[in-house]
Interface confidence: low
């Protein structure tokens, strides 16, 4: 049996305005609202479960519901990546998978979802109230992140219902292109809606859903418009902090990396794009979309932005054996 905590992300509002508005003032807001609703805000869902048979074993599943191409997935714990979280795994559709202890196996489950098995004992072992976050970088939507954790009182022997707790961040830089106009429209819509102070503002009501189609619906257009402009971003405080991570794959042979176009997944390229890249110093690598940098055996510190990924010369799954362990 498993204990699960599933975290759906926010969804654009459904038109649910009550009361009457003058016809003149209604037309433009509805047009803009339609634009906001159909803008296709992507979603990220996170599901965390603890195996009853192995109390120190966690399975994290994350999925991306969007129309774009995924260019990178980063899984972290202890909080969102770049906000105190520690990277557990990085999955790139072309360059492959990297993982760090206590991650045991990271893998693609489908074209738009991944799973990560964690297990450990002692300092690096996850505990029940640890927060796990998944960040999907995609084209053209940008980066979207959601986090989830098991309820502190979870009993691994009992199956707990999924508990929605939306935690989402959008790196707006990646989505400001065409969306800029829509965002401006949403701002104007928000302005119009706020003028009607007689209208009560219902609260966000996340709905419990399955992992296949996680969805938290925002019933208040005004609040949802705010969410579209400045997506709520929260971190669950945890008393269980992961220890410094060592690389999970200290095997011989050079690790080398190549520069990666920000939107590589939109135009997939074969290894020819990086096969001839000069090999840097043995054992060193720099990783991923949030600019992680690491030396072999060291925990990757956080650095500035920049999308650089560094594949193992032996291929995308060289770091991932039959059980994801080397």
């Amino acid at each position: 049996m498993r204990t699960e905590a599933q975290v759906p992300a926010l969804q654009p509002p459904e038109p649910g305005l009550e009361g009457a508005m003058g016809h003149r003032t209604l037309v433009l807001p509805w047009v803009l609202l339609t634009l906001c609703v159909t803008a296709g805000t992507p979603e990220v869902w996170v599901q965390v479960r603890m195996e009853a048979t192995e109390l120190s074993s966690f399975t994290i599943r994350c999925g991306f519901l969007g129309s774009g191409s995924i260019s990178l997935v980063t899984v972290s714990w202890g909080g969102p990546n770049g906000a105190g979280g520690t990277t557990l795994a990085v999955l790139h559709p072309e360059r492959g998978i990297r993982q760090w202890a206590p991650a045991r196996q990271a893998r693609w489950e489908t074209q738009s979802s991944i799973s990560l098995i964690l297990e450990g004992s002692g300092a690096s072992s996850p505990c029940a109230n640890t927060t796990f976050c998944c960040k999907f970088a995609s084209f053209p939507e940008g980066s979207w992140e959601a986090c989830g954790s098991l309820p502190p009182s979870s009993d691994p022997g009992l199956s707990a219902p999924p508990t929605p707790a939306p935690i989402l961040r959008a790196d707006l830089a990646g989505i400001l292109g065409v969306s800029g106009v829509l965002l401006f429209g949403c701002v104007y819509l928000l302005h119009l809606l706020r003028r009607h102070k007689h209208r009560p503002a219902p609260r966000l009501q996340p709905s419990r859903t399955s992992p296949q189609a996680p969805r938290a619906r925002a019933w208040a257009p005004s609040q949802a418009s705010q969410a579209a402009l400045h997506v709520p971003y929260a971190t669950i405080n945890t008393s269980c902090r992961p220890a410094t991570l060592d690389t999970a794959h200290p095997h011989g042979g050079p690790s080398w990396w190549a520069s990666l176009p920000t939107h590589a997944a939109h135009r997939p390229q074969g290894p020819a794009a990086w096969a001839s890249t000069p090999i840097p110093a043995r054992g060193s690598f720099v990783s991923v979309e949030n600019g992680l940098y690491a030396q072999a055996g060291e925990r990757p510190p956080h650095t500035g932005p920049g999308l650089t990924l560094f594949p193992d010369p032996r291929g995308p799954r060289a770091m991932e054996g039959p059980l994801g362990v080397r």
Epitope: P93, W108, Q111, S112, R267, P313, G315, A318
Partner: antibody, heavy 122, light 107 residues
Amino acid sequence: QIQLVQSGPELKKPGETVKISCKASGYTFTTYGMSWVKQAPGKGLKWMGWINTYSGVPTYADDFKGRFAFSLETSASNAYLQINNLKNEDTATYFCARELPFTTIIGTKDYWGQGTTLTVSS
Amino acid sequence: DIVLIQSPATLSVTPGDSVSLSCRASQFISNNLHWYQQKSHESPRLLIKYASQSISGIPSRFSGGGSGTDFTLTVNSVETEDFGMYFCQQSNSWPHTFGGGTKLEIK
């Protein structure tokens, strides 16, 4: 059960165009990538490339760039292989194959269509 | 491109025998190697994925091993339905390549 059903045999002349279909059933079409594999008479298997059924982005092996095109009809769970300006050396059996798991360097082709035999002859 | 060499090209066996088919890669491919069986006028069927992982519905007499550049498919106690072509395929890098195949035939 999971099935990939391909269109029937084709007889074409050089210079013509052919479009082979592959209809998937028994699973969510957009969950798994779709590869295309060529097998010339009495020969081995050659990977032509694949299409991401989620994003619709195709990727072609070097030998199959130019005259070959992968496409989708997602609503009907169909994948298509179109070959333009047919040549005699295109005579082969073409297979569609579902990919598992997904990553652009995809790997395991766990379900295959029955194959479509294309004969190009003047 | 990564070249996969299968040997022997043809293997003649008697039902009940156990056989090993070899696949050698021209460069390191970790465990990114898969085995397929293809009978005459049929489509290939996945037997083993990632060098040694079994596939649901495939008889347990099929097993795989190896890593890096040398791989083996073993068929314990061959049955008549096992005769046909066997291909290995790598997914370590583009383009995916298949071995030339080993024909398993009745002696």
